[in-house]
């Protein structure tokens, strides 16, 4: 546990102006209000630690209420360069430029940042999500079109005195929110440049950032209700493990997913759930207020610690991995989707994980901190937990080394 080390000024304490600056919900992402251009144009921007471009809708789109109008900004500069970002499903493309950017409920600074003005997209914007752009907070290595395009956070740190660190508290509601409730609800906090003690309980535990591209970490052990999955730990990180606020689910490599589901099924076998539930296709419902949380196991991920042969564990509850869904057809019940799914690109610790914890992205010290979130949903019997230290040997062997090819095959 390394929370007691001295910190440089400005790194810790209270950041009142930034608390509660996020809105949204896990299924459609968490967004922060930003202003772009002169005079300032206000947009809601998805906070995404799984990508590295600042990209905003810059043309009319049926799912956008508003968009960035470059022609109205006196400070816009065209970089005369296009950018095309394909996803496994969908894509966005646009034109690169720079403009003045600030975060009203963030540090009191304005920075000139690279902006991708999205002119065309497919399966990118989400109907009803209320965000118009994306703030990629990961590293330059995965920026598009290449790593020479400086990400927003790098620009912010270079141009200001803001410390090279941010922290996220994503607050799942624990119940489904309709559109008006989302607009009015608090979704959490993005603390830029520091750590706010009011947002977590207990101690912060840190895991090294393995490589500065995504926020890559190493998982060394997985337990379901305290039972070790007993897999070669390389499988947990095949081909990587990342912390990604832009993903809803906890996504696991195929073999790990199958083993985890088998174990969760066994632990919750007092009820018979349809196959489609484990696939995320069918909802399961209980009479309002009767969800049997106790029949579902807790899930613990052990992460490499900062000290040799030392690890710590983060434990989530079913309140995190069963996502509440509103369906008019079954509105008299409490219905849920299973929010753990299969991945072909490694483990993704998405909102399902992050909603249990206050997560510190300490870029300056190349580490990610976890503490129990002050806003996580729990019951009177169990709570999310961050605990350690545990002795774990040969943790370096748990990392998977992605074969390097001449051509980048990165597909976000």
């Amino acid at each position: 546990e390394t929370d007691e080390e001295p910190e440089e000024p400005g790194r810790r304490g209270s950041f009142v102006e930034m608390v509660d600056n996020l809105r949204g919900k896990s299924g459609q992402g968490y967004y922060v209000e930003m202003t772009v251009g002169s005079p300032p144009q206000t947009l809601n921007i998805l906070v995404d630690t799984g990508s590295s471009n600042f990209a905003v809708g810059a043309a009319p789109h049926p799912f956008l209420h508003r968009y960035y109008q470059r022609q109205l900004s006196s400070t816009y500069r065209d970089l005369r360069k296009g950018v095309y970002v394909p996803y496994t499903q969908g894509k966005w493309e646009g034109e690169l430029g720079t403009d003045l950017v600030s975060i009203p409920h963030g540090p009191n600074v304005t920075v000139r940042a690279n902006i991708a003005a999205i002119t065309e997209s497919d399966k990118f914007f989400i109907n009803g999500s209320n965000w118009e752009g994306i703030l990629g907070l990961a590293y330059a290595e995965i920026a598009r079109p290449d790593d020479s395009l400086e990400p927003f956070f790098d620009s912010l740190v270079k141009q200001t005195h803001v410390p090279n660190l941010f922290s996220l508290q994503l607050c799942g509601a624990g119940f489904p929110l309709n559109q008006s409730e989302v607009l009015a609800s608090v979704g959490g906090s993005m603390i830029i440049g520091g750590i706010d003690h009011s947002l977590y309980t207990g101690s912060l535990w840190y895991t090294p950032i393995r490589r500065e591209w995504y926020y890559e970490v190493i998982i060394v052990r997985v337990e379901i209700n305290g039972q070790d999955l007993k897999m070669d730990c390389k499988e947990y990180n095949y081909d990587k493990s990342i912390v990604d606020s832009g993903t809803t689910n906890l996504r696991l490599p195929k073999k790990v997913f199958e083993a985890a589901v088998k174990s969760i099924k066994a632990a919750s076998s007092t009820e018979k759930f349809p196959d489609g539930f484990w696939l995320g296709e069918q909802l399961v419902c209980w009479q309002a207020g009767t969800t049997p949380w106790n029949i579902f196991p807790v899930i613990s991920l052990y992460l490499m610690g900062e000290v040799t042969n030392q690890s710590f564990r983060i434990t989530i509850l079913p309140q995190q991995y069963l996502r509440p869904v509103e369906d008019v057809a079954t509105s008299q019940d409490d219905c849920y989707k299973f929010a753990i799914s299969q991945s072909s690109t490694g483990t993704v610790m998405g909102a399902v994980i992050m909603e249990g914890f206050y997560v510190v992205f300490d870029r300056a010290r190349k580490r990610i901190g976890f503490a129990v979130s002050a806003c996580h949903v729990h019951d009177e019997f169990r709570t999310a937990a961050v605990e350690g230290p545990f002795v774990t040997l040969d943790m370096e062997d748990c990392g998977y080394n992605i074969p390097q090819t001449d051509e980048s095959t990165l597909m976000t």
């Epitope: 299924g27 109907n127 009820e271 018979k272 349809p274 296709e281 069918q282 909802l283 369906d327 057809a329």
Partner: antibody, heavy 116, light 107 residues
């Protein structure tokens, strides 16, 4: 209000193919899977398969694996079912349905008639 | 595949009566059974899920019961608008399968 609007009736020749559509509205399209169901007179309901609009993942009834292909266009919130190499056995009413718990919402039906 | 058997193809009843439609699964499906009503020329309408839960807006004269392999849809105080075919469905495992249907006739 959740609605699934299906395309109109089709009269097609044997050996050809047809593409049926199902346009969804009233909910977040990518949050729920879409199923397709076949109904022949006096033969009840047969599940053809399903698609997840968020990533186009599909699962088929083995019986229809070589007959039906499901696709989505999220920009128009529309799911499609392509039926190939049509025979008289494919003459039927086809429904799309939205998942939730079982199939709470159904489209209004598309009649496909295969005739020379 | 799980076979859902509705042994009665037709049932005759009178307005105001109580009628029970049965359905048997070839293997244990827990309570992962739904019931649908289909009127002539219309799409199926969802009535019951999880064997016994009514979908929103479904009149409370429709009641579902059962678990494991034996399921029943009961309509109490039958109304003329209940003239329809009723299908059970298991959604416990792929492939999803339906019963052959029971046509309710009003005397």
């Amino acid at each position: 209000e959740v609605q699934l609007q299906q395309s109109g009736a089709e009269l097609v020749r044997p050996g050809t193919s047809v593409k049926l559509s199902c346009k969804a509205s009233g909910y977040t399209f990518t949050s729920y899977w879409i199923h397709w169901v076949k109904q022949r007179p006096g033969q009840g309901l047969e599940w053809i398969g399903m698609i997840d609009p968020s990533d186009s993942y599909t699962k088929y009834n083995q019986k229809f694996k070589d007959k039906a292909t499901l696709t989505v266009d999220t920009s128009s919130s529309t799911t499609y079912m392509h039926l190939s190499s049509l025979t008289s056995e494919d003459s039927a009413v086809y429904y799309c349905a939205r998942s939730g718990v079982a199939f709470p919402y159904w489209g209004q039906r598309t009649l496909v008639t295969v005739s020379a | 595949d799980i076979v859902m058997t509705q042994s009665q193809k037709f049932m005759s009843t009178s307005v105001g009566d109580r009628v029970s439609v049965t359905c048997k699964a070839s293997q244990n499906v827990g309570t992962n059974v739904a019931w649908y009503q289909q009127k002539p020329g219309q799409s199926p309408k969802a009535l019951i899920y999880s064997a016994s839960h009514r979908y929103s807006g479904v009149p409370d004269r429709f009641t579902g019961s059962g678990s494991g392999t034996d399921f029943t849809l009961t309509i109490s105080n039958v109304q003329s608008e209940d003239l329809a075919e009723y299908f059970c469905q298991q959604y416990n495992s792929y492939m999803y399968t339906f019963g052959g249907g029971t046509k309710l006739e009003i005397k």
